[in-house]
């Protein structure tokens, strides 16, 4: 089920607002393994490939970029919300 | 529908620690931020601190740290707020809220637990 | 820390009139990165939880009454309701998130006449 979050967070990321949403290098995902028939539901590579992947902020999977996007706390921006706003 | 369930009224003694829970539902847990803010009776709001349950990030108003701990279980989508060394002026109404977010960023409350109340007397 | 002030104290109105309430942060609120104030407005009614009016200090909340608008840049924000009504009898709060620790002003109070 598609949240109202996640549709916010698709519409911002392909408005692209490059300060609060990060893509990793292409090569972290250049390698796709094929989609398994009958599998279900994939797991969230938030959930680990990409855990550690925002400093201050909540990492979200954006499946039409295959790629982690990061949402940031307040106080904190660039591409993995490590930078503190002055 | 979106919807935060507190729990009950408590009354404590001076110097002991309460455990306030802060049960979410309607929503993915893990996505939004689950804010303390606390209300004195005839007082202002104030902020006492915020856990993200996804990244486990938490960030503490300065007043409340090493009082105030905050935790969230992900498996109940619950979020805790233990305070201890408890005085008479921690009186007051305790709300969880969960922090939302828009344009990549969070920092507003846009829905709010009902309350609990914290009364600290000898 | 940032402070937030607001003014007035209280106010009290008649049913049908405009009123504006203001509210004034230390430092400014504006995001380089989005070019947006980090600014929310929540009304508190008695015997209540606080409920989101405003966010980014003028974007409406789903589901509010299209008389609550907010407005203002940098330091200085503005809630205004165009036409009162009863049930707008509440307590307004206005809270910066543009760095931690998150803060509120001290509210300001809205009676009808």
């Known amino acids: 089920d598609l949240q109202e979050a996640d549709l916010d967070l698709l519409r911002v990321t392909l408005s692209s607002k490059p300060q609060a949403l990060a893509t990793p290098n292409k090569e972290e995902h250049g390698k796709r393994k094929k989609k398994g028939k009958g599998l279900g539901k994939k797991r969230d590579p938030c959930l680990r490939k990409y855990k550690d992947f925002c400093i201050h902020g909540e990492c979200k999977y954006v499946k039409e970029l295959r790629a982690p996007s990061c949402i940031c706390h307040p106080g904190y921006h660039g591409e993995r919300c490590h930078g503190l706003s002055l | 529908q979106v919807q935060l369930v507190q729990s009950g009224a408590e009354v404590k003694k001076p110097g002991a620690s309460v455990k306030l829970s802060c049960k979410a539902s309607?929503?993915?847990?893990?996505?939004?931020?689950i804010t303390w803010v606390r209300q004195a009776p005839g007082q202002g709001l104030e902020w006492i601190g915020e856990?993200?349950?996804?990244?486990?990030?938490?960030y503490y108003n300065e007043k409340f740290k090493g009082r105030a701990t905050l935790t969230a279980d992900k498996s109940t989508s619950t979020a805790y707020m233990e305070l201890s060394s408890l005085r008479s002026e921690d009186t007051a109404v305790y709300f969880c809220?969960?922090?939302?977010?828009?344009?990549?960023?969070?920092?507003?409350?846009?829905?709010w637990g009902q309350g609990t109340l914290l009364t600290v007397s000898s | 820390d940032i402070v937030m002030t607001q003014s007035p104290d209280s106010l009290a109105v008649s049913v049908g009139e405009r009123v504006t309430m203001n509210c004034k942060s230390s430092?400014?609120?504006?995001?380089?990165?989005?070019?947006?104030?980090?600014l929310a407005w929540y009304q508190q009614k008695p015997g209540q939880s606080p409920k989101l009016l405003i966010y980014?200090?003028?974007t409406r909340e789903s589901g509010v009454p299209d008389r609550f608008s907010g407005s203002g840049s940098g330091t200085d924000f503005t809630l205004t309701i165009s036409s009162v009504q009863a049930e707008d009898v509440a307590v307004y709060y206005c809270?910066?998130?543009?760095?931690?620790?998150?803060?509120f002003g001290q509210g300001t109070k809205l009676e009808i006449k």
């Open positions: 309607g929503y993915t847990f893990r996505t939004y931020g």
């Open positions: 809220a969960r922090e939302s977010f828009s344009d990549g960023y969070y920092g507003y409350f846009d829905y």
């Open positions: 856990i993200f349950p996804g990244s486990g990030n938490t």
């Open positions: 430092q400014s609120l504006l995001y380089s990165t989005n070019q947006k104030n980090s």
């Open positions: 980014w200090a003028s």
């Open positions: 809270q910066q998130y543009y760095r931690y620790p998150l803060t």
